[in-house]
């Protein structure tokens, strides 16, 4: 997001209250070009050996308020026969993203930046087998 100073004179970046003097332009720009998203496959969630489902995570006090999150369908992985393989585990791949959270009871609205862990897909890993001593 682009940070735009509130006044025509840019605030002093060394001032302690610098972050109180900026406003954020929430317009989302696709710098990679429009064709990028159309190449993003959406069927991996079903074709994967560790398939996942997507859930619409809504938080009206967050920007963005809608985030689609992955959840692994099974604890185990699916083998070539379509059966669950008990030697392989399905694990969630998570990505840390930055979101803006609305401060409660603030008027006009003020937001704070927060980190959020989002599930983006699942992958298959070998189960840890502990040998008996």
């Amino acid at each position: 997001a682009a940070i735009i100073p509130q006044s025509s004179a840019c605030p002093n970046t060394e001032a302690k209250d610098f972050l109180q003097n900026v406003k954020v332009n929430l317009k989302v720009f696709n710098s990679l070009g429009a064709k990028v998203s159309s190449r993003r496959p959406s069927d991996y969630l079903n074709r994967s050996t560790s398939p996942w489902t997507l859930h619409r995570n809504e938080d009206p006090d967050r920007y963005p308020s809608v985030i689609w999150e992955a959840q692994c369908r099974h604890q185990r992985c699916v083998n070539a026969e379509g059966k669950l393989d008990h030697h392989m585990n399905s694990v969630l791949i998570q990505q840390e993203i930055l979101v803006l959270k609305r401060e409660p009871e603030s008027c006009p609205f003020t937001f704070r930046v927060e980190k959020m862990l989002v599930g983006v897909g699942c992958t298959c890993v070998a189960s840890i087998v502990r040998q008996a001593a």
């Epitope: 929430l26 989302v28 696709n30 429009a34 064709k35 998203s37 159309s38 993003r40 959406s42 069927d43 969630l45 079903n46 489902t53 997507l54 859930h55 619409r56 809504e58 009206p60 006090d61 920007y63 963005p64 308020s65 809608v66 689609w68």
Partner: antibody, heavy 119, light 107 residues
Framework: EVQLVQSGAEVKKPGASVKVSCKAS????????FHWVRQAPGQGLEWIGV????????AYNQNFRDRATLTADKSTSTAYMELSSLRSEDTAVYYC????????????WGQGTLVTVSS | DIQMTQSPSSLSASVGDRVTITCKAS??????VGWFQQKPGKSPKLLIY???NRYTGVPSRFSGSGSGTDFTFTISSLQPEDFATYFC?????????FGQGTKLEIK
């Protein structure tokens, strides 16, 4: 120019299923959510559910969870809404609408598809 | 589910009149409210989003205000093409819900 063009009117018998299509043009199909809303004759609007064509994710109104299925075909930039076990109360105009996920509002709507359920 | 109670359900007015429609949410929806115009046999058309922002190309006679649970939609000077049904909608949380609509008729 953004356009959402829906399939034509349908007449169905109770217990049957209907599949309504919504073809998008004028923007990148996978960038925005598609929501489905219906309007019974002389009634208000009722939200059915949402699909994100970019990731295949869906979410439904509890009232429709067991009967509605939302899908999207990226190759033809078309979203679909299938409603099963139809009853007379499902007679309505069904709309698809584009939702700007980041901005948070519905901007473009399809022209609507009238589904009549009658024996 | 969040209920959106819209009033009045119908309204008679003349060209040039100032018209106000209200919408009350059953719980706070912040500013996540839109206002739509619908003419017979047509799909809804977005006029106002985020309670008070006019959508692209919408004439300045249309305005909206409010936050929390109480919202107002105003047409400052009615034009002949404004006679239609208007409804509010919340997209604060799903299931997204709509007001029952206000039918604006010529007096």
């Amino acid at each position: 120019e953004v356009q959402l063009v829906q399939s034509g009117a349908e007449v169905k018998k109770p217990g049957a299923s209907v599949k309504v299509s919504c073809k998008a043009s004028g923007y990148t199909f996978t960038d925005y959510e598609f929501h489905w809303v219906r309007q019974a004759p002389g009634q208000g609007l009722e939200w059915i559910g949402v699909i994100h064509p970019g990731n295949g994710g869906t979410a439904y109104n509890q009232n429709f969870r067991d009967r509605a299925t939302l899908t999207a075909d990226k190759s033809t930039s078309t979203a679909y809404m299938e409603l099963s076990s139809l009853r007379s109360e499902d007679t309505a105009v069904y709309y698809c609408t584009r939702f700007l996920t980041y901005e948070g509002y519905f901007d473009y709507w399809g022209q609507g598809t009238l589904v009549t359920v009658s024996s | 589910d969040i209920q959106m109670t819209q009033s009045p359900s119908s309204l008679s007015a003349s060209v040039g009149d100032r018209v106000t429609i209200t919408c009350k949410a059953s719980q706070s929806v912040s500013i996540d409210v839109g206002w739509f115009q619908q003419k017979p046999g047509k799909s809804p058309k977005l006029l106002i989003y985020h309670a008070s922002n006019r959508y692209t190309g919408v004439p300045s006679r249309f305005s909206g205000s409010g936050s929390g649970t109480d919202f107002t939609f105003t047409i400052s000077s009615l034009q002949p093409e404004d006679f239609a049904t208007y409804f509010c909608q919340q997209d604060y949380s799903s299931p997204y819900t709509f007001g029952q609509g206000t039918k604006l008729e010529i007096k």
